[in-house]
């Protein structure tokens, strides 16, 4: 006869572990008892339970309420037991000793592995701003037993670095994702992927990237100078820029206050019917929490009575 068991039994924290011990022998043999003990190296054997053919299961006080026989139907040659609600401290070596007649006594060992699934956390790095060098975008930490695997899933170009801290019964893994911030990364997902044998599927935590930037400002509306003549209605200047966070716009006139009747509507400067009073240098001031930009234009309102056309300056300043 021989004992059938597993070299390693793997169970997730909190689940029940089946410790297998099946005596495969001549069917004329009788199994008298199966003794289970924990036999970690360097420590004396600690009795777990005794499974007696006549008197049933006796569980040692240290494991009271935690060791049971598998549910019926039961084979008299099966000495397997269930260890309820496995905890990390249960991880180790176990031995089953089977007393049979007339084949004699047999023993076998198995190792119980208790998997502790990780609970990952993602921490965003400092605020990302365009123009920075290599910057920490996010770090992801997961602790478990055995050590989890932490990787990144993203379309964004960057570099990763990992470090691991071993504890007595687990390991914590931290992975950092560094990148050179650019406006094209805005709104892009950066996903931390944690793999572990105790997880049915990978755990994923997604962080949306926010990169602060402010584009150069420019003014539209003076493309056709001939349209800027006395009496024209609906003339407007529009300030063009983009940024994160979205910028605010402010219009001023460099050579004096804004003429009466001129309306400021965010990025747009609306004019009443044009007069020569509207000629001047107008400045669009764009700003957000990250930066500010200016763009100025010179408006020269034409008098149709005058023969010669005048040139218009478009100056952009930052």
């Amino acid at each position: 006869g021989e004992l059938e068991t597993s070299d390693v039994v793997t169970v997730v924290l909190g689940q029940d572990a089946k410790l297998p011990c099946f005596y495969r022998g001549d069917s004329g043999e009788q199994v008298g008892q199966v003794a289970w003990a924990r036999v970690d190296a360097g420590e004396g054997a600690q009795e777990l339970a005794l499974l007696h053919s006549k008197y049933g299961l006796h569980v040692s006080p240290a494991y009271e309420g935690r060791v049971e026989q598998p549910p019926p139907p039961r084979n008299p040659l099966d000495g397997s037991v269930l260890l309820r609600n496995a905890v990390q401290a249960d991880e180790g070596e176990y031995e089953c000793r089977v007393s049979t007649f007339p084949a004699g006594s047999f023993q076998a060992r198995l190792r119980l592995r208790v998997l502790v699934p990780p609970l990952p956390s993602l921490n965003p790095g400092p605020a990302l701003e365009e123009g920075q060098g290599l910057t920490l975008a996010a770090s992801c930490t997961a602790e478990g037993s055995p050590a989890p695997s932490v990787t990144w899933d993203t379309e964004v170009k960057g570099t990763t670095s990992s470090r691991s801290f071993k504890h007595s019964r687990s390991a914590a893994v931290t992975s950092e994702f560094h990148l050179v911030p650019s406006r094209s990364m805005n709104g892009q997902p950066l996903t931390c992927v944690v793999s572990h044998p105790g997880l049915l599927q990978d755990q994923r935590i997604t962080h949306i990237l926010h990169v602060s930037f402010l584009a150069e400002a420019s003014v539209r509306g003076l493309e056709d100078q001939n349209l800027w003549h006395i009496g024209r209605e609906g003339a407007m200047l529009k300030c063009l820029s983009e940024g994160q966070p979205p910028p605010s716009y402010n219009w001023t006139r460099l050579d004096g206050p804004l003429p009466s009747g001129v309306r400021v509507d965010g990025d747009t400067l609306g004019f009443p019917p044009l007069t020569t009073e509207h000629s001047g240098i107008y400045v669009c001031h764009v700003s957000n929490e990250f930066s500010s930009r200016d763009s100025q234009v010179t408006v020269d309102v034409l008098d149709p009575q005058e023969d010669s056309g005048k040139q218009v300056d478009l100056v952009s300043a930052s």
Epitope: S27, Q30, K54, A103, G104, S105
Partner: antibody
Framework: EVQLQQSGPELVKPGASVKIACRAS????????IHWVSQRHGKSLEWIGY????????GYNQKFMNKATLTVDHSSNTAYMELRSLTSEDSAVYYC????????????WGQGTLVTVSA | ENVLTQSPEIMSASPGEEVTMTCSAS?????MHWFQQKSTISPKLWIY???KLASGVPGRFSGSGSGKSYSLTIRNMEAEDVATYYC?????????FGGGTKLEIK
């Protein structure tokens, strides 16, 4: 108290058959294999085979395969061994036995049934 | 089948004497068991798993051995030890008994 009560002595003629009974009491009949052992006068013991009352499964010593047939009757908690085509060589005491475990192994035996084959 | 040969077939010893009988197997076995039988009554399991004493067996009895060679020893022979002792193996089918050692008292 566990007891294995065997049927009385048998005197049979050569070529005939005999059926020995072993009535079990004091334990769960289906829980143990019942083994049969023979002992010719002044000689050693010989294992014949066993039967498992739970499912009727049995195993034989090849030497007795064509000599002995083991059966059980659950209604009376009795195991039987039929011996056929008897010769004087089959004259012996036949024991039924169960292997039991408490703090240690021990064996319950029937008192033995003497079978004498004689013309 | 695994043939068990016991020796001596017959031996006698004085009270208080140490007695050793042997059992040799034709094939290696993991364990050997011993039975005691007095006259024609049913045999009793005496030693199991090579060296473990069955219930009620006096501590002066011991068993040892491995592989193909096993022995039973009585440290201080007593009159009640007069019997025939059979070795028995169950490591392989068919289970087999030795021919017996008859122990007498001088």
């Amino acid at each position: 108290e566990v007891q294995l009560q065997q049927s009385g002595p048998e005197l049979v003629k050569p070529g005939a058959s005999v059926k020995i009974a072993c009535r079990a009491s004091g334990y769960t009949f289906t829980a143990y294999n019942i083994h049969w052992v023979s002992q010719r006068h002044g000689k050693s013991l010989e294992w014949i085979g066993y039967i498992y009352p739970n499912n009727g499964g049995s195993g034989y010593n090849q030497k007795f395969m064509n000599k002995a047939t083991l059966t059980v009757d659950h209604s009376s908690n009795t195991a039987y061994m039929e011996l056929r085509s008897l010769t004087s060589e089959d004259s012996a005491v036949y024991y039924c036995a169960i292997f039991d475990y408490d703090e240690a192994w021990f064996i319950y035996w029937g008192q033995g049934t003497l079978v004498t084959v004689s013309a | 089948e695994n043939v068990l040969t016991q020796s001596p077939e017959i031996m006698s010893a004085s009270p208080g004497e140490e007695v050793t009988m042997t059992c040799s197997a034709s094939s290696s076995v993991s364990y050997m068991h011993w039975f005691q039988q007095k006259s024609t009554i049913s045999p009793k399991l005496w030693i199991y798993d090579t060296s473990k004493l069955a219930s009620g067996v006096p501590g002066r009895f011991s068993g040892s051995g491995s592989g193909k060679s096993y022995s039973l020893t009585i440290r201080n022979m007593e009159a009640e030890d007069v019997a025939t002792y059979y070795c028995f193996q169950g490591s392989g089918s068919p289970y087999t008994f030795g021919g017996g050692t008859k122990l007498e008292i001088k």
